[in-house]
């Protein structure tokens, strides 16, 4: 074709070297990211799909970068910010994953995002029929009003002394400990 290095045939910063044989008047040594006989083709480095978890690949030129979806981070979007790894739930709470997020399931008496806030177990008025609620280190205790009984004062006490407990399973009398 008669083209030589003097014609500047190498694009994108390619280095032109005179060919060793008559059939090739020049050879282009391409810089990283380019290919083709004249370094005219950009290598699609993002086609290797380096970004994980649905991240978008961005070829800046000097480097690849991954634009991560919400909930992920890191050079390859490899860090899942929504999992329980390294997530501390205080005061005996346990981390629960789900729905692309995490939350703490708090032990009795604690609340808030990290279970760091003391919760008032009596705030929800758990004692029925006018029973009085007392916060206790192990939870709560209901002091029932006259005529009621049960952990939450949910059962009326009948005048004859019997209580309206739910019917016992066959073979068990009310008051027997269930095995």
């Amino acid at each position: 074709s008669g083209v030589t290095c003097a014609d500047g045939p190498c694009f994108n910063g390619g280095l032109c070297v005179g060919g060793a044989d008559p059939d090739s008047a020049y050879i282009c040594h391409c810089p990283p990211g380019f290919q083709g006989s004249n370094c005219e083709k950009r290598v699609d480095r993002c086609s290797l799909q380096p970004c994980r978890n649905g991240g978008l690949c961005l070829d800046l030129g000097h480097a690849l970068r991954c634009r991560c979806r919400a909930g992920f981070a890191g050079p390859r979007c490899e860090h899942d910010l929504d999992d329980c790894a390294g997530r501390a739930c205080a005061n005996g709470g346990t981390c629960v994953e789900g729905g692309g997020a995490h939350r703490c399931s708090c032990a009795l008496g604690f609340g808030g995002r990290d279970c760091r806030e003391r919760a008032d177990p009596c705030a929800a008025r758990p004692c029925a029929h006018g029973g009085r609620c007392y916060a206790h280190f192990s939870g709560l205790v209901c002091a029932c009003a006259p005529g009621y009984m049960g952990a939450r004062c949910e059962f009326p006490v009948h005048p004859d002394g019997a209580s309206a407990l739910p019917a016992a399973p066959p073979g068990l009398r009310p008051g027997d400990p269930q095995r």
Partner: antibody, heavy 123, light 112 residues
Framework: QSVEESGGRLVTPGTPLTLTCTVS????????MSWVRQAPGKGLEWIGI?????DPYYASWAKGRFTISKTSTTMDLKITSPTTEDTATYFC????????????????????WGPGTLVTVSS | ALVMTQTPSSVSAAVGGTVTINCQAS??????LAWYQQKPGQRPKLLIY???NLESGVPSRFKGSGSGTEYTLTISDLECDDAAIYYC??????????????FGGGTEVVVK
């Protein structure tokens, strides 16, 4: 390796203006380039970049207000419809950074910068 | 949005003294933080990249540190020539950020 801006001048509001960044010592196909502006007495404000492959990315506030394009040796910033709030010194800068790696720490920075070109929008 | 908050906005110290500039990111930026120096009427100059790496030619009196969301630029043995405005800048690559390369508001260093 250097960059230099040109094209800054006094324009009336609504008159499109194109700024040019001319580079020497490196190839625009190998580096992303960025535009940053600085209003008088204010801080630096990132406008957008154009990648080595020619893809532009803009700050959300700059979308529709600016257009970034490039040739083999120059990068342009078009201010589509200037307002008085666009009065500023406009800088272009090359983006450098660590090669893509598995390292948890990577970096990007702007170097070198041009001296800037002043755009004044006034009626 | 990723927001870079720089404190203080201005700091003053005597020649030979030390100043500390803080930069807080609204999200973990994994040490992808740069510091720039800008003198009046001049272009910004890169000082630190990758949170703690000193750009060639920059005196070792400039020290960058930090990780996660908290970063610091410390200038020791202050010289008159250090009087300038200093900016932090980050790159945070998510699909949700509206500014890929935000700058902090700047900190003016006055040398007495």
């Amino acid at each position: 390796q250097s960059v230099e801006e040109s094209g800054g001048r006094l324009v009336t509001p609504g008159t499109p203006l194109t700024l040019t960044c001319t580079v020497s010592g490196f190839s625009l196909s190998r580096y992303a380039m960025s535009w940053v502006r600085q209003a008088p007495g204010k801080g630096l404000e990132w406008i957008g970049i154009i990648t080595g492959g020619g893809d532009p990315y803009y700050a959300s506030w700059a979308k529709g207000r600016f257009t970034i394009s490039k040739t083999s040796t120059t990068m342009d910033l078009k201010i589509t419809s200037p307002t008085t709030e666009d009065t500023a010194t406009y800088f272009c800068a090359r983006m450098i950074g660590s090669e893509y790696a598995s390292s948890s720490e990577y970096y990007d920075a702007f170097d070198p910068w041009g001296p800037g070109t002043l755009v004044t929008v006034s009626s | 949005a990723l927001v870079m908050t720089q404190t203080p906005s201005s700091v003053s110290a005597a020649v030979g003294g030390t100043v500390t500039i803080n930069c807080q990111a609204s999200q973990n930026i994994y040490s992808n933080l740069a510091w720039y120096q800008q003198k009046p009427g001049q272009r910004p100059k890169l000082l630190i990249y990758g949170a703690s790496n000193l750009e060639s030619g920059v005196p070792s009196r400039f020290k960058g540190s930090g990780s996660g969301t908290e970063y610091t630029l410390t200038i020791s043995d202050l010289e008159c020539d250090d009087a300038a405005i200093y900016y932090c800048q980050s790159a945070y690559y998510t699909t949700s950020v509206d500014v890929l390369y935000p700058f902090g508001g700047g900190t003016e260093v006055v040398v007495k």
